[in-house]
């Protein structure tokens, strides 16, 4: 049996809402809106699976489908990282990986996807309807986030397939991806929308297949374009909160990334750029890549296996890659 985490079905406005504007005039803003929202936008997918061999452990997989290069991945649970979620792991392609209990193994699967295994026992263990979110910071697309959860009815060993239209928050939908034509179209669209703002907004219909489907602050031009139109943000109800949430410091960050260099619109310096950077004792992680990344939450330091701080004498480079945490 496969279960699926659903995103609300976004309905187009009712035909009666067209009013005096006319069908032809109304179609143009919808087309422009679709272009503005989807042009050059990548996609993030999230999978959550309860392992059949270890019924108390979860595997979370996240991937970025875009042509850009990933510069940071943040995995959180209980909601998006900047909205009450608690950071489970932060993965950086050069500085390595840091994870917090109950995360057992965070690793790069590929250059654009990661996986995280969660321990299921103990007070901080996840439960079946916990929401897990992955945020990818990439160049040049910007920062993208998607969330997913495994419904309580899921069979062990099966995963909830990624939602057809992932729950996404675009901090910047393509730094370099919007052409002048599209920009003009978007401005024109805004002009049209302002001109006709007295019209009632289209209704949002909750998904018929998911009684607990969240309400999304977005609307789509048509059912046909749903697959391409990304919902900017949605909150998922979860009845299970991590036990360690109260101990989190939402405004702090991984202390060993306190002094990440800022680099605007270019790929990182050579492979040795941060190889010898000492790991600071404390500090606040300030996002790089033109300030696109949200801060990653930090908990009090752990000395157990949940904390990974480059034991390899060759530094963080030895920790990187699909091998993940040694």
């Amino acid at each position: 049996m496969r279960t699926e985490a659903q995103v609300p079905a976004l309905q187009p406005p009712e035909p009666g809402l067209e009013g005096a504007m006319g069908h032809r005039t109304l179609v143009l803003p919808w087309v422009l809106l679709t272009l503005c929202v989807t042009a050059g936008t990548p996609e993030v997918w999230v999978q959550v699976r309860m392992e059949a061999t270890e019924l108390s452990s979860f595997t979370i997989r996240c991937g970025f489908l875009g042509s850009g290069s990933i510069s940071l991945v943040t995995v959180s649970w209980g909601g998006p990282n900047g909205a009450g979620g608690t950071t489970l792991a932060v993965l950086h392609p050069e500085r390595g990986i840091r994870q917090w209990a109950p995360a057992r193994q965070a690793r790069w699967e590929t250059q654009s996807s990661i996986s995280l295994i969660l321990e299921g026992s103990g007070a901080s263990s996840p439960c079946a309807n916990t929401t897990f979110c992955c945020k990818f910071a990439s160049f040049p697309e910007g920062s993208w986030e998607a969330c997913g959860s495994l419904p309580p009815s899921s069979d062990p060993g099966l995963s909830a397939p990624p939602t057809p239209a992932p729950i996404l928050r675009a901090d910047l939908a393509g730094i370099l991806g919007v052409s002048g034509v599209l920009l003009f179209g978007c401005v024109y669209l805004l002009h049209l929308l302002r001109r006709h703002k007295h019209r009632p907004a289209p209704r949002l219909q909750p998904s018929r297949t998911s009684p607990q489907a969240p309400r999304a602050r977005a609307w789509a031009p048509s059912q046909a374009s749903q697959a391409a139109l990304h919902v900017p943000y949605a909150t998922i109800n979860t009845s299970c909160r991590p036990a360690t949430l109260d101990t989190a410091h939402p405004h702090g960050g991984p202390s060993w990334w306190a002094s990440l260099p800022t680099h605007a619109a270019h790929r990182p310096q050579g492979p040795a750029a941060w190889a010898s950077t000492p790991i600071p004792a404390r500090g606040s992680f300030v996002s790089v890549e033109n300030g696109l990344y949200a801060q990653a939450g930090e908990r009090p330091p752990h000395t157990g296996p949940g904390l990974t701080l480059f034991p390899d004498p060759r530094g963080p480079r030895a920790m990187e890659g699909p091998l993940g945490v040694r």
Partner: antibody
């Protein structure tokens, strides 16, 4: 058309150094990791590690730490494998292999393979 | 390291026969991370099946893959002469990536 074209065969003496190139075409080079795989004559495949083509960071399994190095010439969409202080047991065919993007159906596979470079180490 | 054991090491089949080869892992491998490659003599390997059961581009539909946990298999429903090759399984459940020793398929 996506392809990985490797440099030609090489004959070396023990103690020398060999550098194999792998030129990628048909895709965005810095989006996919590049792995290297060794196949000794009549033997199976052995993974040598991979390099992140965006960050330039290399990862090696224990068996290939020390004498082996990966490098990049991003502007030429080319990856390199260098083996220092060659030994007889390094005689093999070496493949570069693109690390697949990863998807909801799988990850950690090599979706495009290079043409292979045979290195013979003999005194 | 996870050790992958392939059996049989060599097998032969006549055109039209159904063929199954297996790959046994020393510890559990998630289906996401189990893949198969085909390598013909003197050629580079090719991705054949990824994520246990997904056929790579251009692979004939007579091939299929299945399995879970520590036991996986590749099946050819009706073998053809062009299928003669060595087939390797590969895992990436835990580091490092490892390959099986291969099953060589000969066509009678």
């Amino acid at each position: 058309q996506i392809q990985l074209v490797q440099s030609g065969p090489d004959l070396k003496k023990p103690g020398e150094t060999v550098k194999i190139s792998c030129k990628a075409s048909g895709y965005t080079f810095t989006t996919y990791g590049m792995s290297w795989v060794k196949q000794a004559p009549g033997r199976g495949l052995k993974w040598m590690g991979w390099i992140n083509t965006y960050s330039g960071v290399s990862t090696f399994p224990d068996d290939f730490k020390g004498r082996f190095a990966f490098s990049l010439e991003t502007s030429a969409s080319t990856a390199y494998l260098q083996i220092n202080n060659l030994k007889n047991e390094d005689s093999a065919t070496y493949f570069c292999a693109r690390l697949g993007m990863g998807s909801t159906t799988g990850a950690g596979y090599f979706d495009v393979w290079g043409t292979g470079t045979t290195v013979t180490v003999s005194s | 390291d996870i050790v992958l054991t392939q059996s049989p090491a060599i097998m032969s089949a006549s055109p039209g026969e159904k063929v199954t080869m297996t790959c046994s892992a020393s510890s559990s491998v998630s289906s996401w991370y189990l893949h198969w490659y085909q390598q013909k003599s003197g050629a580079s390997p090719k991705l054949w099946i990824y994520g246990t059961s997904n056929l790579a581009s251009g692979v004939p539909a007579r091939f299929s893959g299945s399995g879970s946990g520590t036991s996986y298999s590749l099946t050819i429903s009706s073998v053809e002469a062009e299928d003669a090759a060595t087939y390797y399984c590969q895992q990436y459940r835990s580091d490092p990536y490892t390959f099986g020793s291969g099953t060589k398929l000969e066509i009678k």
